[in-house]
């Protein structure tokens, strides 16, 4: 899995989108999890409604929301009031039984609020490496990293 970078500004909201094949994943609940370390587990942050037929309803866990467009094939995660500690590697997952397929690997980067004049630096993200500079920008808030640039193994 390639990794897509989404950048957000501290204190603001960041929306992460994970496209998938609607028919392949029809009837499956989805989840957003945070990768704990290189070889660690992916810790569930929030999942779609327990009842799949209501998975289009927005579901919150703290400051993180998830909603699933099952026809369009897009899982959307909203991180509200983004903070430096939200930076890190995440996954969008499709759940089936006790298994989970990775839909997308996401690196969340948190940029300093330009209106915040404290000398806190302008970017926080974990595992900074030279390879980040080589990643191409997909659009204003996300870009893809080539496979292998993030040292975490795929868990699909």
């Amino acid at each position: 899995h390639n990794t897509t970078v989404f950048q957000g500004v501290a204190g603001q909201s960041l929306q992460v989108s994970c496209p998938y094949d609607s028919m392949k994943h029809w009837g499956r609940r989805k989840a957003w999890c945070r990768q704990l370390g290189e070889k660690g587990p992916c810790q569930r942050v929030v999942s779609t409604h327990n009842l799949w037929l209501l998975s289009f309803l927005r579901r919150w866990n703290g400051s993180t929301a998830i909603t699933d467009d099952t026809l369009g094939g897009t899982l959307t995660i909203t991180l509200r009031n983004l903070q430096p500690h939200d930076a890190g590697l995440y996954q969008c997952q499709s759940l089936h039984g006790s298994e989970a397929d990775t839909l997308r690997k996401v690196l969340v980067e948190v940029l300093a609020d330009p209106l915040d004049h404290r000398d806190a630096g302008d970017l926080w993200f974990p595992g900074e490496s030279e390879s980040f500079e080589d990643a191409h920008v997909e659009h204003s808030i996300s870009r893809s990293l080539l496979e292998g640039e993030i040292p975490f193994p795929p868990t699909s």
Epitope: S22, M23, W26, G27, L51, W52, L53, L54, S55, F56, D68, D69, T70, L71, G72, G73
Partner: antibody, heavy 118, light 107 residues
Framework: EVQLLESGGGLVQPGGSLRLSCAAS????????MSWVRQAPGKGLEWVSV????????YYADSVKGRFTISRDNSKNTLYLQMNSLRAEDTAVYYC???????????WGQGTLVTVSS | EIVMTQSPATLSVSPGERATLSCRAS??????LAWYQQKPGQAPRLLIY???TRATGIPARFSGSGSGTEFTLTISSLQSEDFAVYYC?????????FGGGTKVEIK
């Protein structure tokens, strides 16, 4: 109050074409997936096709794939079903239904009868 | 394609009596099941979703239960307006499919 009003049904010969319309009111049309569901005389319900709120995603039952086309005009709050190469087995009452992206049909129109016969 | 089997095909009940309708799925659908009511010459109406949640405006005499492959729709005390055909629908397998229906008629 949600209202769905189908039109365009009628008698058509095998191999012919027909376009059904469904005029919607009482809700934000562009926010909802819309489907066509049919019911052959004296038979049960069969889902036919669905289109997402934006119109960007469309899906069909295998029995109509390649012959029927679903579309919508959100500026006119109208859903369409273009039916080509009609067969006798397409004879049914066709209902338009407002639903969720998971194909739960919350509201139904009163239906329009399509008869395919020579 | 998931096959939904409803039984009985016809149920004869007296007004005021209890009616129990069954729906069986060929594979587990968890609780992702809906029930619809269709009166003669009318469009179907959503009654129950999520196997047991009544849709807006549906009287409390209608209740749904079950999960997995076996589901039941119960009408606790039949009113004259309840005589109709009832359909179950599964949602989590593509394509969505309906049962063949159960006709509830006056005994």
């Amino acid at each position: 109050e949600v209202q769905l009003l189908e039109s365009g049904g009628g008698l058509v010969q095998p191999g012919g074409s027909l376009r059904l319309s469904c005029a919607a009111s009482g809700f934000t049309f562009s926010s909802y997936a819309m489907s066509w569901v049919r019911q052959a005389p004296g038979k049960g319900l069969e889902w036919v096709s669905v289109i997402s709120g934006s119109g960007g995603s469309t899906y069909y039952a295998d029995s109509v794939k390649g012959r029927f086309t679903i579309s919508r005009d959100n500026s006119k709050n109208t859903l369409y079903l273009q039916m080509n190469s009609l067969r006798a087995e397409d004879t049914a009452v066709y209902y338009c239904a407002k639903g969720t992206p998971t194909l739960l049909f919350q509201h139904w129109g009163q239906g329009t009868l399509v008869t395919v016969s020579s | 394609e998931i096959v939904m089997t409803q039984s009985p095909a016809t149920l004869s009940v007296s007004p005021g009596e209890r009616a129990t309708l069954s729906c069986r799925a060929s594979q587990s659908v968890s609780s992702n099941l809906a029930w619809y009511q269709q009166k003669p010459g009318q469009a179907p109406r959503l009654l129950i979703y999520g196997a047991s949640t009544r849709a807006t405006g549906i009287p409390a005499r209608f209740s749904g239960s079950g999960s997995g492959t076996e589901f039941t729709l119960t009408i606790s005390s039949l009113q004259s307006e309840d005589f109709a055909v009832y359909y179950c629908q599964q949602l989590p397998y593509w394509p969505p499919t309906f049962g063949g229906g159960t006709k509830v008629e006056i005994k």
